[in-house]
């Protein structure tokens, strides 16, 4: 596929981590600067649902 | 089950290409970025490139930058890393690896969650 | 682009010890930092994430902390199996940088 080129480095101006307005299964990345699939967010401490933060769950699946 | 795959690798003269490919699977690459990550021998982890596939955003490191060129084709559901003008600081270890986000009030919090096995890239002549 | 200084380059302790690995980012990267562990011929896995998050199917001897441009690793009790390489990564700036590593060898 053709690619366009995200010069990333020459836009660190601090409003480059403002995230944008995403869809509900995505969230802002400000690495690559964009929207990208999102899964739900999990308190550390207990692996419950926090009543602080909207969108959190469980810990996510196990990695290889 | 997620899984990312290498192949591509082997020895190459100075100057020479190659282009490595990451078959992935258990997820679908349009939905995250795909990282490019080298060790040379005795080293510690490099940042080679990553992409974008839903936008075709790409970033490299300087190290890289006008030599390699990373892509990916959402149809294969792989990633590709081509490599080109070889020099002997190049040998490494090439690993892919999913960029993972979770929801954090709307922001990505998230790591590199699952990588491949790592391909051998050795520049030589 | 942002550094990220890792220390101790390497350590040696045993089992049961208390491990604290610092990383230290030359700007604000707020709580974008992820740690890893890495053993000789396998690919790295995935510890801690947004600076203190533990990722899942992770020892919770394993912690995180920090915020800025000062972050911390523990083990809070050293097991045979921690022997490792670990690394620290930004991502909240483009491009991701790891710190050098930090081995952890037995005393």
């Known amino acids: 596929m053709g690619a366009r080129r995200l010069r990333v480095r020459s836009q660190r101006s601090r409003d480059s981590s403002v995230p944008t307005q995403c869809n509900q299964t995505e969230c802002f990345d400000p690495l690559v600067r964009n929207c990208v699939s999102c899964e739900l967010f999990h308190t550390p401490d207990t692996g419950h649902t926090s009543s602080l933060e909207p969108g959190t769950a469980l810990q996510p699946q196990e990695g290889s | 089950e997620v899984q990312l795959v290498e192949s591509g690798g082997g020895l190459v003269q100075p100057g020479g290409s190659l282009r490595l490919s990451c078959a992935a699977s258990g997820f679908t690459i349009s939905s995250s970025s795909i990282h490019w990550v080298r060790q040379a021998p005795g080293k510690g982890l490099e940042w080679v490139a990553w992409?974008?596939?839903?936008?075709?955003?790409?970033d490299y490191a300087d190290s890289v930058k006008g030599r390699f060129t990373i892509s990916a084709d959402t149809s294969k559901n792989t990633a590709y890393l081509q490599m080109n003008s070889l020099r002997a600081e190049d040998t490494a270890v090439y690993y892919c690896?999913?960029?993972?986000?979770?929801?954090?009030?709307?922001?990505?919090?998230?790591?590199?969650?699952?990588w491949g096995q790592g391909t051998l890239v050795t520049v030589s002549s | 682009d942002i550094q990220m200084t890792q220390s101790p380059s390497s350590l040696s302790a045993s089992v049961g010890d208390r491990v604290t690995i610092t990383c230290r980012a030359s700007?604000?990267?707020?709580?974008?930092v992820a740690w890893y562990q890495q053993k000789p011929g396998k690919a790295p896995k995935l510890l801690i994430y947004?600076?203190?998050f533990l990722y899942s199917g992770v020892p919770s001897r394993f912690s995180g902390s920090g915020s800025g441009t000062d972050f911390t690793l523990t083990i809070s009790s050293l097991q045979p199996e921690d022997f490792a390489t670990y690394y620290c990564?930004?991502?909240?700036?483009?491009?991701?940088?790891f710190g050098q590593g930090t081995k952890v060898e037995i005393k």
């Open positions: 947004a600076a203190s």
């Open positions: 690896a999913r960029r993972v986000c979770y929801n954090r009030l709307g922001v990505c919090a998230g790591g590199m969650d699952y």
């Open positions: 700007e604000d990267i707020s709580t974008a």
């Open positions: 990564q930004q991502s909240q700036i483009s491009p991701p940088t």
């Open positions: 992409v974008l596939p839903s936008v075709g955003f790409t």
